[in-house]
Interface confidence: medium
């Protein structure tokens, strides 16, 4: 059985303050069943950015329909970027359970925020 891969193709993305940022993430397999979550930062201090299953994430939208059968694209778009959004974002696959168990993280995409040109 091929090992699940979580692929974040861009190592870095640069966006002007006020614009939207797209962070790409795909998985190599639909198995095992379980959600994808996005975090900013790693370790215990990481910040939950997007969780399809529950919560309210008003500035974040899924690029593809994550509820569609056989969807393997879990890219997100973050709107109205500010300097405080800068950091490294990780796409993380969980195995469904009670609670869900973290399986694999993508390599991360560093988001840098440029001053908006005046």
């Amino acid at each position: 059985e091929e090992e699940l891969q979580v692929i974040q193709p861009e190592k870095s993305v640069s966006v002007a303050a006020g614009d939207s940022a797209t962070l790409n993430c795909t998985v190599s397999s639909l198995i095992p069943v379980g959600p994808i979550q996005w975090f900013r930062g790693a370790g215990p201090g990481r910040e939950l950015i997007y969780n399809l299953k529950e919560g309210h994430f008003p500035r974040v939208t899924a690029v593809s329909d994550p509820t569609k059968r056989n969807n393997m694209d879990f890219s997100i778009r973050i709107s109205n970027i500010t300097p405080a959004d800068a950091g490294t974002y990780y796409c993380v696959k969980f195995r469904k359970g009670s609670p869900d168990v973290e399986l694999k993280s993508g390599a991360g995409t560093e988001l840098s925020v440029r001053a908006k040109p005046s």
Epitope: G43, I49, H56, N80, T82
Partner: antibody, heavy 119, light 108 residues
């Protein structure tokens, strides 16, 4: 409906400790960063501390750093503020405030808990 | 650190008249500015976020404008229940989160 209810306030002497709690309901507590904001008598609002949704990331105002500790129990939907080495200038109403998203404004506030530090 | 300066400190307005409150940031905060209302003896309540968006349940007599460093909260037709202190809050740079010093709105 979102509800935030603080408890644990009271009167203490300088140098003593107190722990505030904030019971949250009506939203997905584990998905939101939470904050403590205080207001000294007759004064404006002062941000005190923030904790991220998972509980592992914390920030503090310089005025409380090293004395106050913010924590949360996502299984109990409760936010805490452990206040040590209290000073007279910590006297205030302490509000817990829900953050709209990880990098956002405070969209709901608790009713507040009064902490009085006096000898 | 971004400093928010609110003016005037106190505003006395007759019922039905317009009230205009100002909040100025020491550096740009984009559109990341909120306004909170605090009535005497009560907790703050969110009125406006992202400079111009009214929070849920807020009457349309409240409106926000501005971006960058200069922001305005307007109460188009003041009601007696609008007597309160109004605070602006920036969330463009943090920590720390910063609030303005407040504007007290009194009914004439």
């Amino acid at each position: 409906d979102v509800q935030l209810v603080e408890s644990g306030g009271g009167v203490v002497r300088p140098g003593e400790s107190l722990r505030l709690s904030c019971a949250a309901s009506g939203f997905s507590f584990s998905s939101h960063a939470m904050n403590w904001v205080r207001q000294a008598p007759g004064e404006g609002l002062e941000w005190v501390s923030r904790i991220n949704s998972g509980g592992g990331g914390t920030d503090y105002a310089e005025s409380v750093k090293g004395r106050f500790t913010i924590s949360r129990d996502n299984s109990e939907n409760t936010l805490y503020l452990q206040m040590n080495s209290l000073r007279a200038e910590d006297t205030a109403v302490y509000y817990c405030a829900k953050q709209y998203d990880w990098n956002g404004f405070f969209d709901y506030w608790g009713l507040g808990a009064l902490v009085t530090v006096s000898s | 650190e971004t400093v928010l300066t609110q003016s005037p400190a106190t505003l006395s307005v007759s019922p039905g008249e317009r009230a205009t409150l100002s909040c100025r940031a020491s550096q740009t905060v984009g559109s990341k500015l909120a306004w909170h209302q605090q009535k005497p003896g009560q907790a703050p309540r969110l009125l406006i976020y992202d400079a111009t968006n009214r929070a849920t349940g807020i009457p349309d007599r409240f409106s926000g404008s501005g971006s960058g460093t200069d922001f305005t909260l307007t109460i188009s037709s003041l009601q007696t229940e609008d007597s309160a202190v109004y605070y602006c809050q920036q969330y463009y740079y943090w920590p720390p989160y910063r609030f303005g010093g407040g504007t007290k709105v009194e009914i004439k």
